[in-house]
């Protein structure tokens, strides 16, 4: 049986993939900040989890994914204010029973050390400094990313 | 078009209470989140905190935490925000403000004011 | 927390006249900064948003610019109903801060 939350995670990945695709992103939008591959965009209103969720994707955009603990770092210095928490997008699976990020893959453990418990309703949030896990319910800020498009240089044949 | 009319004048003692309610009308009240903002007698504007009238989670600027409460009526498109323990210094017009985008801080519509002066 | 200092803080100036305010932060705060005009006894109207971005149906006249620590607010020709009072503020925190304002008064 999956949660309120892992059903909403579920349709709204299922009807990104059914989206027609669009063109390559090669700069970010207005207001977004970009780190590397990506842009970020940080909320400035206070949401549960599942509605952040719901939010980033009226951006055209999905919860932040994490890839490893450099990418947390470089986006934890992009944040400005010490005591401020972000919803990221992971959750807790119950059925699972381990982390799973919004796209559906697993976390590596070593990626990212969480304070708190791993259990139901529990949902991921960041700091400045920290990973916590928070219930699902809690309202605080989130972030939004969208995935830049590498641009691939052309390789012409010989003439 | 977007509307914010809020409460009437209050003439309050110090250390007693506030709560100043603010009605939207012409949007959809929860899809935007509302904030507070005051402005003392000759000063500058003040921001206090915010609460999203969707969810009912609130955000307090760190000054007024232990004495504001921001909490709103869905049914009846109305925030409220109240503040205790009021000083001389609490003397001021407060807004109601409208956050124009859930991604940036500007106000785009704010409330006509409502005057809370603290004497004795 | 992050400071605003305007100046001028009070400004006299004619109709037809070009008119600057500056906004000046204590840190660095991007391009998240708002401008708002303020009559007496009335509440706060948005001009700009993001430094520079006109909000729906403020007059060409008022623009803004800026990035970083330094922004400013200028009207290009005032007319009589743009003497008021004009505040900047950042988002660039959390903990959104205004500037002090500037009066602009008739010369």
């Known amino acids: 049986q999956k949660s309120s939350i892992e059903k909403c995670s579920v349709d709204i990945q299922q009807s990104r993939n059914k989206t027609t695709e669009r063109p390559g992103l090669l700069n970010c939008p207005i207001y977004w900040q970009q780190l590397r591959e990506k842009c970020l965009l940080f909320s400035h209103t206070v949401n549960p989890w599942n509605n952040s969720l719901a939010d980033c994707s009226t951006k055209e955009s999905s919860l932040l994914l994490i890839r490893d603990k450099d990418e947390l770092i470089h986006t934890q210095n992009l944040i400005r204010d010490k005591a401020i928490l972000f919803w990221i997008g992971l959750n807790f699976s119950l059925s699972e029973k381990n982390w799973k990020w919004i796209n559906g893959s697993f976390l590596n453990s070593n990626d990212l050390e969480i304070r708190g418990d791993a259990k139901e309703n529990s949902c991921i949030s960041i700091s400045q400094t920290s990973v916590y896990s928070e219930y699902c319910s809690t309202e605080i800020r989130w972030i939004c990313q969208k995935e830049l498009t590498p641009v691939r240089n052309k390789v012409y044949p010989d003439s | 078009q977007v509307q914010l009319v809020q409460s009437g004048a209050e003439v309050k003692k110090p250390g007693a209470s506030v709560k100043v309610s603010c009605k939207a009308s012409?949007?959809?009240?929860?899809?935007?989140?509302m904030n507070w903002v005051r402005q003392a007698p000759g000063q500058g504007l003040e921001w206090m905190g915010l609460?999203?009238?969707?969810?009912?989670?609130?955000y307090y600027n760190q000054k007024f935490k232990d004495r504001v409460t921001m909490t709103r009526d869905t049914s009846i498109s109305t925030a409220y925000m109240e503040l205790s323990r009021l000083r001389s210094d609490d003397t001021a017009v407060y807004y109601c403000?409208?956050?124009?985008?859930?991604?940036?801080?500007?106000?785009?519509?704010w409330g006509q004011g409502t005057t809370v002066t603290v004497s004795s | 927390d992050i400071q605003l200092t305007q100046s001028p803080s009070f400004l006299s100036a004619s109709v037809g006249d070009r008119v600057t305010i500056t906004c000046k932060a204590s840190?660095?705060?991007?391009?998240?900064v708002v401008w708002y005009q303020q009559k007496p006894g009335k509440a706060p109207k948005l001009l700009i948003d993001?430094?520079?971005i006109r909000h729906t149906g403020v007059p060409s006249r008022f623009s803004g610019s800026g990035s970083g620590t330094e922004f400013t607010l200028t009207i290009s020709s005032l007319q009589p109903e743009d003497f008021a009072d004009y505040f900047c503020?950042?988002?660039?925190?959390?903990?959104?801060?205004f500037g002090g304002g500037t009066k602009l008064e008739i010369k």
């Open positions: 403000a409208r956050l124009g985008d859930n991604y940036r801080g500007y106000f785009d519509s």
């Open positions: 012409g949007y959809s009240f929860t899809g935007y989140t």
């Open positions: 609460i999203n009238p969707s969810s009912g989670g609130t």
């Open positions: 840190q660095d705060v991007g391009t998240a």
């Open positions: 993001w430094a520079s």
């Open positions: 503020q950042q988002y660039s925190t959390y903990l959104y801060t």
